[in-house]
Interface confidence: low
Protein backbone atom coordinates (compact mmCIF):
# COMPACT_ATOMS: atom_id res chain seq x y z
CA UNK A 1 0.00 0.00 0.00
CA UNK A 2 1.37 3.41 -0.95
CA UNK A 3 0.43 6.29 1.29
CA UNK A 4 -0.50 9.14 -1.05
CA UNK A 5 1.72 12.21 -1.36
CA UNK A 6 -1.21 14.19 0.06
CA UNK A 7 -0.79 12.24 3.29
CA UNK A 8 2.69 13.67 3.75
CA UNK A 9 1.44 17.17 2.99
CA UNK A 10 -1.42 16.63 5.44
CA UNK A 11 1.08 15.77 8.15
CA UNK A 12 2.92 19.02 7.55
CA UNK A 13 -0.35 20.96 7.58
CA UNK A 14 -1.23 19.29 10.89
CA UNK A 15 2.06 20.44 12.39
CA UNK A 16 1.47 23.97 11.10
CA UNK A 17 -2.00 24.01 12.64
CA UNK A 18 -0.60 22.81 15.95
CA UNK A 19 1.91 25.67 15.80
CA UNK A 20 -0.84 28.18 15.04
CA UNK A 21 -2.99 26.94 17.92
CA UNK A 22 -0.57 28.43 20.44
CA UNK A 23 -2.44 30.81 22.72
CA UNK A 24 0.01 31.57 25.47
CA UNK A 25 3.75 31.58 25.86
CA UNK A 26 5.29 28.21 26.61
CA UNK A 27 7.96 30.20 28.46
CA UNK A 28 5.42 31.26 31.05
CA UNK A 29 4.64 27.57 31.59
CA UNK A 30 8.13 26.14 32.04
CA UNK A 31 7.30 25.03 35.57
CA UNK A 32 4.45 22.92 34.16
CA UNK A 33 6.64 21.02 31.72
CA UNK A 34 6.38 17.29 32.06
CA UNK A 35 8.07 14.27 30.54
CA UNK A 36 5.21 12.11 29.25
CA UNK A 37 7.57 9.36 28.16
CA UNK A 38 6.80 9.28 24.47
CA UNK A 39 7.48 5.65 23.41
CA UNK A 40 10.13 6.62 20.88
CA UNK A 41 11.41 3.06 20.57
CA UNK A 42 8.01 2.00 19.20
CA UNK A 43 8.62 4.32 16.25
CA UNK A 44 12.07 3.01 15.38
CA UNK A 45 13.14 2.29 11.82
CA UNK A 46 13.43 -1.42 12.54
CA UNK A 47 9.70 -1.87 11.93
CA UNK A 48 8.27 -3.42 8.82
CA UNK A 49 5.64 -1.36 7.04
CA UNK A 50 2.97 -3.89 8.05
CA UNK A 51 3.71 -3.15 11.68
CA UNK A 52 3.99 0.61 11.46
CA UNK A 53 0.67 1.39 9.79
CA UNK A 54 -1.50 0.32 12.77
CA UNK A 55 0.83 2.07 15.25
CA UNK A 56 0.67 5.31 13.27
CA UNK A 57 -3.09 4.91 13.02
CA UNK A 58 -3.33 4.52 16.80
CA UNK A 59 -1.17 7.61 17.33
CA UNK A 60 -3.37 9.79 15.11
CA UNK A 61 -6.58 8.32 16.52
CA UNK A 62 -5.43 9.15 20.04
CA UNK A 63 -4.53 12.73 19.03
CA UNK A 64 -7.99 13.02 17.48
CA UNK A 65 -9.61 11.73 20.70
CA UNK A 66 -7.55 14.06 22.88
CA UNK A 67 -8.48 17.18 20.93
CA UNK A 68 -12.15 16.21 20.44
CA UNK A 69 -13.12 16.51 24.10
CA UNK A 70 -15.24 19.38 25.37
CA UNK A 71 -12.31 20.52 27.51
CA UNK A 72 -10.23 20.79 24.35
CA UNK A 73 -12.96 22.72 22.54
CA UNK A 74 -12.91 25.25 25.37
CA UNK A 75 -9.12 25.60 25.19
CA UNK A 76 -8.51 26.16 21.49
CA UNK A 77 -9.66 28.34 18.62
CA UNK A 78 -12.71 26.66 17.06
CA UNK A 79 -11.75 27.40 13.44
CA UNK A 80 -8.22 26.03 13.86
CA UNK A 81 -9.59 23.02 15.73
CA UNK A 82 -12.00 22.23 12.89
CA UNK A 83 -9.18 22.40 10.35
CA UNK A 84 -7.08 20.22 12.65
CA UNK A 85 -9.85 17.58 12.86
CA UNK A 86 -10.17 17.58 9.07
CA UNK A 87 -6.43 16.95 8.58
CA UNK A 88 -6.37 14.18 11.19
CA UNK A 89 -9.50 12.57 9.74
CA UNK A 90 -7.94 12.51 6.28
CA UNK A 91 -4.78 10.91 7.63
CA UNK A 92 -6.82 8.28 9.47
CA UNK A 93 -8.62 7.52 6.21
CA UNK A 94 -5.31 7.13 4.34
CA UNK A 95 -3.97 4.73 6.97
CA UNK A 96 -7.24 2.79 7.18
CA UNK A 97 -7.18 2.33 3.40
CA UNK A 98 -3.76 0.71 3.80
CA UNK A 99 -5.01 -1.61 6.53
CA UNK A 100 -8.02 -2.60 4.39
CA UNK A 101 -5.69 -3.37 1.48
CA UNK A 102 -4.14 -6.03 3.68
CA UNK A 103 -1.14 -4.33 5.20
CA UNK A 104 -0.82 -5.57 8.76
CA UNK A 105 -3.93 -7.78 8.79
CA UNK A 106 -2.53 -11.14 7.72
CA UNK A 107 -0.70 -11.53 11.03
CA UNK A 108 -0.82 -9.44 14.16
CA UNK A 109 2.66 -9.68 15.64
CA UNK A 110 2.82 -9.38 19.41
CA UNK A 111 5.39 -6.61 18.97
CA UNK A 112 2.83 -4.51 17.09
CA UNK A 113 0.20 -5.04 19.81
CA UNK A 114 2.72 -4.00 22.45
CA UNK A 115 3.50 -0.88 20.42
CA UNK A 116 -0.17 0.08 20.18
CA UNK A 117 -0.53 -0.46 23.92
CA UNK A 118 2.53 1.74 24.57
CA UNK A 119 0.95 4.54 22.50
CA UNK A 120 -2.33 4.20 24.41
CA UNK A 121 -0.52 4.37 27.75
CA UNK A 122 1.34 7.47 26.59
CA UNK A 123 -1.96 9.23 25.87
CA UNK A 124 -3.36 8.02 29.19
CA UNK A 125 -0.45 9.80 30.90
CA UNK A 126 -1.26 12.97 28.96
CA UNK A 127 -4.96 12.76 29.87
CA UNK A 128 -4.12 12.17 33.53
CA UNK A 129 -1.75 15.16 33.51
CA UNK A 130 -4.49 17.42 32.11
CA UNK A 131 -6.92 16.21 34.77
CA UNK A 132 -4.38 16.77 37.55
CA UNK A 133 -3.68 20.26 36.22
CA UNK A 134 -7.44 20.91 35.96
CA UNK A 135 -7.14 21.61 32.22
CA UNK A 136 -5.31 24.86 32.90
CA UNK A 137 -4.10 27.00 29.95
CA UNK A 138 -0.50 26.11 30.79
CA UNK A 139 -1.30 22.39 30.94
CA UNK A 140 -2.89 22.57 27.50
CA UNK A 141 0.07 24.53 26.14
CA UNK A 142 2.49 21.91 27.46
CA UNK A 143 0.35 19.18 25.89
CA UNK A 144 0.14 21.03 22.57
CA UNK A 145 3.94 21.30 22.46
CA UNK A 146 4.30 17.64 23.40
CA UNK A 147 1.84 16.48 20.72
CA UNK A 148 3.66 18.62 18.19
CA UNK A 149 6.90 16.90 19.16
CA UNK A 150 5.54 13.35 19.15
CA UNK A 151 3.52 13.86 15.97
CA UNK A 152 6.68 15.20 14.37
CA UNK A 153 8.53 12.03 15.35
CA UNK A 154 5.80 9.81 13.90
CA UNK A 155 5.76 11.92 10.73
CA UNK A 156 9.46 11.21 10.35
CA UNK A 157 8.65 7.52 10.51
CA UNK A 158 6.12 7.92 7.70
CA UNK A 159 8.75 9.71 5.62
CA UNK A 160 11.32 7.00 6.26
CA UNK A 161 8.75 4.38 5.20
CA UNK A 162 8.16 6.26 1.97
CA UNK A 163 11.89 6.59 1.25
CA UNK A 164 12.44 2.86 1.79
CA UNK A 165 9.92 1.93 -0.92
Amino acid sequence: CDLPQTHSLGSRRTLMLLAQMRRISLFSCLKDRHDFGFPQEEFGNQFQKAETIPVLHEMIQQIFNLFSTKDSSAAWDETLLDKFYTELYQQLNDLEACVIQGVGVTETPLMKEDSILAVRKYFQRITLYLKEKKYSPCAWEVVRAEIMRSFSLSTNLQESLRSKE
Epitope: A19, Q20, S25, S28, L30, S152
Partner: antibody, heavy 118, light 107 residues
Framework: QVQLVQSGAEVKKPGASVKVSCKAS????????IHWVRQAPGQGLEWMGW????????GYAQKFQGRVTMTRDTSTSTVYMELSSLRSEDTAVYYC???????????WGQGTLVTVSS | DIQMTQSPSSLSASVGDRVTITCRAS??????LNWYQQKPGKAPKLLIY???SLESGVPSRFSGSGSGTDFTLTISSLQPEDFATYYC?????????FGQGTKVEIK
Protein backbone atom coordinates in the same frame (compact mmCIF):
# COMPACT_ATOMS: atom_id res chain seq x y z
CA GLN B 1 10.62 30.88 1.26
CA VAL B 2 11.40 31.74 4.87
CA GLN B 3 14.07 34.38 5.30
CA LEU B 4 15.53 36.31 8.21
CA VAL B 5 17.57 39.26 6.99
CA GLN B 6 19.70 41.12 9.51
CA SER B 7 21.15 44.61 9.46
CA GLY B 8 24.79 45.25 8.57
CA ALA B 9 27.97 45.17 10.64
CA GLU B 10 28.50 47.79 13.35
CA VAL B 11 31.56 49.23 15.08
CA LYS B 12 30.88 50.76 18.49
CA LYS B 13 32.84 52.34 21.30
CA PRO B 14 32.74 50.88 24.83
CA GLY B 15 29.74 52.21 26.77
CA ALA B 16 27.67 52.79 23.61
CA SER B 17 24.55 50.89 22.49
CA VAL B 18 23.84 48.91 19.36
CA LYS B 19 20.51 48.02 17.78
CA VAL B 20 20.41 45.07 15.40
CA SER B 21 17.36 44.39 13.24
CA CYS B 22 16.00 41.11 11.88
CA LYS B 23 13.40 41.28 9.12
CA ALA B 24 11.28 38.15 8.70
CA SER B 25 9.51 37.03 5.54
CA UNK B 26 7.99 33.91 4.03
CA UNK B 27 5.90 32.87 7.04
CA UNK B 28 3.21 34.19 9.39
CA UNK B 29 5.29 36.51 11.57
CA UNK B 30 3.02 36.43 14.64
CA UNK B 31 2.94 32.63 14.88
CA UNK B 32 6.55 32.18 15.91
CA UNK B 33 9.06 33.40 18.44
CA ILE B 34 12.35 34.98 17.45
CA HIS B 35 15.39 34.24 19.59
CA TRP B 36 18.77 35.92 19.65
CA VAL B 37 22.03 33.99 19.91
CA ARG B 38 25.52 35.42 19.77
CA GLN B 39 28.94 34.03 18.96
CA ALA B 40 32.20 35.67 19.97
CA PRO B 41 35.11 35.23 17.50
CA GLY B 42 36.32 31.63 17.58
CA GLN B 43 33.91 30.79 20.40
CA GLY B 44 30.69 28.83 20.86
CA LEU B 45 27.05 29.90 20.75
CA GLU B 46 25.41 31.85 23.56
CA TRP B 47 21.66 32.28 23.96
CA MET B 48 20.50 35.80 24.77
CA GLY B 49 16.72 35.69 24.90
CA TRP B 50 13.41 35.47 23.06
CA UNK B 51 10.70 37.69 21.69
CA UNK B 52 7.10 36.61 21.18
CA UNK B 53 6.30 38.17 17.81
CA UNK B 54 2.58 38.01 18.59
CA UNK B 55 2.28 39.53 22.07
CA UNK B 56 5.59 41.36 22.25
CA UNK B 57 6.52 39.37 25.35
CA UNK B 58 10.20 38.84 26.02
CA GLY B 59 12.53 36.71 28.10
CA TYR B 60 16.21 37.42 28.58
CA ALA B 61 19.13 35.40 29.86
CA GLN B 62 20.09 36.60 33.35
CA LYS B 63 23.52 37.54 32.04
CA PHE B 64 22.02 40.21 29.76
CA GLN B 65 19.19 41.36 32.03
CA GLY B 66 19.14 45.14 32.25
CA ARG B 67 21.37 45.55 29.19
CA VAL B 68 19.30 43.95 26.46
CA THR B 69 15.95 45.03 25.02
CA MET B 70 14.06 43.14 22.34
CA THR B 71 11.22 44.81 20.47
CA ARG B 72 9.24 44.18 17.32
CA ASP B 73 7.41 46.07 14.59
CA THR B 74 4.54 43.91 13.32
CA SER B 75 3.87 46.23 10.38
CA THR B 76 7.27 45.39 8.89
CA SER B 77 7.69 41.91 10.48
CA THR B 78 10.93 43.09 12.05
CA VAL B 79 12.44 42.22 15.42
CA TYR B 80 15.09 44.38 17.07
CA MET B 81 17.72 43.57 19.66
CA GLU B 82 19.35 46.47 21.46
CA LEU B 83 22.37 45.91 23.69
CA SER B 84 23.58 48.80 25.84
CA SER B 85 26.70 49.57 27.92
CA LEU B 86 28.83 47.73 25.41
CA ARG B 87 32.20 46.33 26.41
CA SER B 88 34.94 44.68 24.41
CA GLU B 89 33.69 41.19 25.32
CA ASP B 90 30.41 41.96 23.52
CA THR B 91 32.31 41.78 20.22
CA ALA B 92 30.50 38.96 18.47
CA VAL B 93 28.29 37.90 15.59
CA TYR B 94 24.65 38.31 16.65
CA TYR B 95 22.10 35.95 15.12
CA CYS B 96 18.34 36.04 15.14
CA UNK B 97 16.64 32.67 14.78
CA UNK B 98 13.06 31.55 14.20
CA UNK B 99 11.87 29.09 16.80
CA UNK B 100 9.73 26.21 15.57
CA UNK B 101 8.62 25.59 19.15
CA UNK B 102 10.15 24.58 22.41
CA UNK B 103 13.57 25.98 21.68
CA UNK B 104 14.70 24.70 18.34
CA UNK B 105 15.47 26.95 15.41
CA UNK B 106 14.77 26.03 11.82
CA UNK B 107 15.85 29.33 10.24
CA TRP B 108 18.62 31.74 11.19
CA GLY B 109 19.58 35.22 10.05
CA GLN B 110 22.93 35.63 8.29
CA GLY B 111 24.41 37.22 11.41
CA THR B 112 25.50 40.75 12.28
CA LEU B 113 29.06 41.40 13.40
CA VAL B 114 29.23 43.94 16.22
CA THR B 115 32.74 45.11 17.04
CA VAL B 116 33.33 47.00 20.29
CA SER B 117 36.61 48.84 20.23
CA SER B 118 37.98 52.10 21.55
CA ASP C 1 21.83 27.10 34.53
CA ILE C 2 22.10 23.74 32.80
CA GLN C 3 25.63 22.99 31.62
CA MET C 4 26.11 21.11 28.36
CA THR C 5 29.36 19.22 27.90
CA GLN C 6 30.32 17.92 24.47
CA SER C 7 33.01 15.40 23.69
CA PRO C 8 35.33 15.27 21.99
CA SER C 9 36.08 18.95 21.41
CA SER C 10 37.61 18.00 18.06
CA LEU C 11 38.17 14.90 16.00
CA SER C 12 39.84 13.92 12.75
CA ALA C 13 38.07 11.52 10.46
CA SER C 14 38.04 10.35 6.87
CA VAL C 15 35.25 10.33 4.30
CA GLY C 16 33.13 7.22 4.89
CA ASP C 17 33.92 7.01 8.61
CA ARG C 18 31.23 6.61 11.24
CA VAL C 19 31.43 9.55 13.62
CA THR C 20 29.88 9.82 17.08
CA ILE C 21 29.65 12.99 19.16
CA THR C 22 28.31 12.91 22.69
CA CYS C 23 26.64 15.59 24.75
CA ARG C 24 25.96 15.45 28.48
CA ALA C 25 23.60 17.71 30.41
CA SER C 26 24.26 18.65 34.04
CA UNK C 27 20.70 17.61 34.89
CA UNK C 28 17.90 15.70 33.18
CA UNK C 29 16.49 17.53 30.17
CA UNK C 30 14.10 14.79 29.01
CA UNK C 31 14.47 14.88 25.22
CA UNK C 32 14.74 18.66 24.82
CA LEU C 33 18.06 18.39 23.02
CA ASN C 34 18.88 19.75 19.57
CA TRP C 35 21.91 19.43 17.30
CA TYR C 36 23.25 22.08 14.93
CA GLN C 37 25.95 22.09 12.28
CA GLN C 38 27.96 25.25 11.64
CA LYS C 39 30.45 25.99 8.89
CA PRO C 40 32.92 28.88 9.05
CA GLY C 41 31.30 32.26 8.42
CA LYS C 42 27.82 30.75 8.28
CA ALA C 43 24.84 30.58 10.62
CA PRO C 44 24.16 27.28 12.40
CA LYS C 45 21.89 24.77 10.68
CA LEU C 46 19.40 22.56 12.52
CA LEU C 47 20.08 18.84 12.09
CA ILE C 48 18.24 17.05 14.88
CA TYR C 49 15.56 18.31 17.25
CA UNK C 50 13.90 16.68 20.26
CA UNK C 51 16.93 14.37 20.64
CA UNK C 52 16.17 12.14 17.67
CA SER C 53 13.94 13.89 15.12
CA LEU C 54 15.66 14.53 11.82
CA GLU C 55 14.99 18.00 10.49
CA SER C 56 13.36 18.10 7.06
CA GLY C 57 15.95 18.09 4.26
CA VAL C 58 18.78 16.77 6.45
CA PRO C 59 20.43 13.60 5.06
CA SER C 60 19.48 10.36 6.81
CA ARG C 61 23.14 9.62 7.62
CA PHE C 62 22.62 11.97 10.59
CA SER C 63 20.87 10.50 13.59
CA GLY C 64 20.40 11.42 17.21
CA SER C 65 19.64 9.40 20.30
CA GLY C 66 19.44 9.71 24.05
CA SER C 67 17.20 10.98 26.79
CA GLY C 68 17.69 12.44 30.24
CA THR C 69 21.31 13.52 30.50
CA ASP C 70 23.22 11.61 27.80
CA PHE C 71 22.83 12.21 24.09
CA THR C 72 24.60 11.17 20.91
CA LEU C 73 24.84 12.54 17.39
CA THR C 74 25.96 9.95 14.85
CA ILE C 75 27.04 10.47 11.25
CA SER C 76 26.87 6.98 9.75
CA SER C 77 29.14 7.68 6.79
CA LEU C 78 31.00 10.98 6.81
CA GLN C 79 30.76 12.99 3.59
CA PRO C 80 33.07 15.84 2.44
CA GLU C 81 30.35 18.43 3.20
CA ASP C 82 30.05 17.20 6.81
CA PHE C 83 33.36 18.69 7.92
CA ALA C 84 32.13 21.42 10.27
CA THR C 85 31.54 22.23 13.93
CA TYR C 86 28.62 20.57 15.69
CA TYR C 87 26.77 22.00 18.69
CA CYS C 88 24.23 20.46 21.02
CA UNK C 89 21.69 22.73 22.69
CA UNK C 90 19.27 22.11 25.52
CA UNK C 91 15.84 23.70 25.30
CA UNK C 92 14.46 22.28 28.52
CA UNK C 93 14.78 25.43 30.56
CA UNK C 94 15.96 28.98 30.06
CA UNK C 95 18.62 30.13 29.67
CA UNK C 96 18.96 27.72 26.77
CA UNK C 97 22.55 26.58 26.67
CA PHE C 98 24.83 25.12 24.02
CA GLY C 99 27.70 22.70 24.25
CA GLN C 100 31.15 24.12 23.50
CA GLY C 101 31.15 22.50 20.06
CA THR C 102 32.89 19.60 18.35
CA LYS C 103 35.02 20.37 15.33
CA VAL C 104 35.10 17.55 12.77
CA GLU C 105 38.25 17.84 10.66
CA ILE C 106 39.65 15.92 7.70
CA LYS C 107 42.23 13.31 8.65
Amino acid sequence: QVQLVQSGAEVKKPGASVKVSCKASGYTFSNYYIHWVRQAPGQGLEWMGWMDSNSGGTGYAQKFQGRVTMTRDTSTSTVYMELSSLRSEDTAVYYCAKEVFSGWYDYWGQGTLVTVSS
Amino acid sequence: DIQMTQSPSSLSASVGDRVTITCRASQSISSYLNWYQQKPGKAPKLLIYAASSLESGVPSRFSGSGSGTDFTLTISSLQPEDFATYYCQQSYSTPYTFGQGTKVEIK
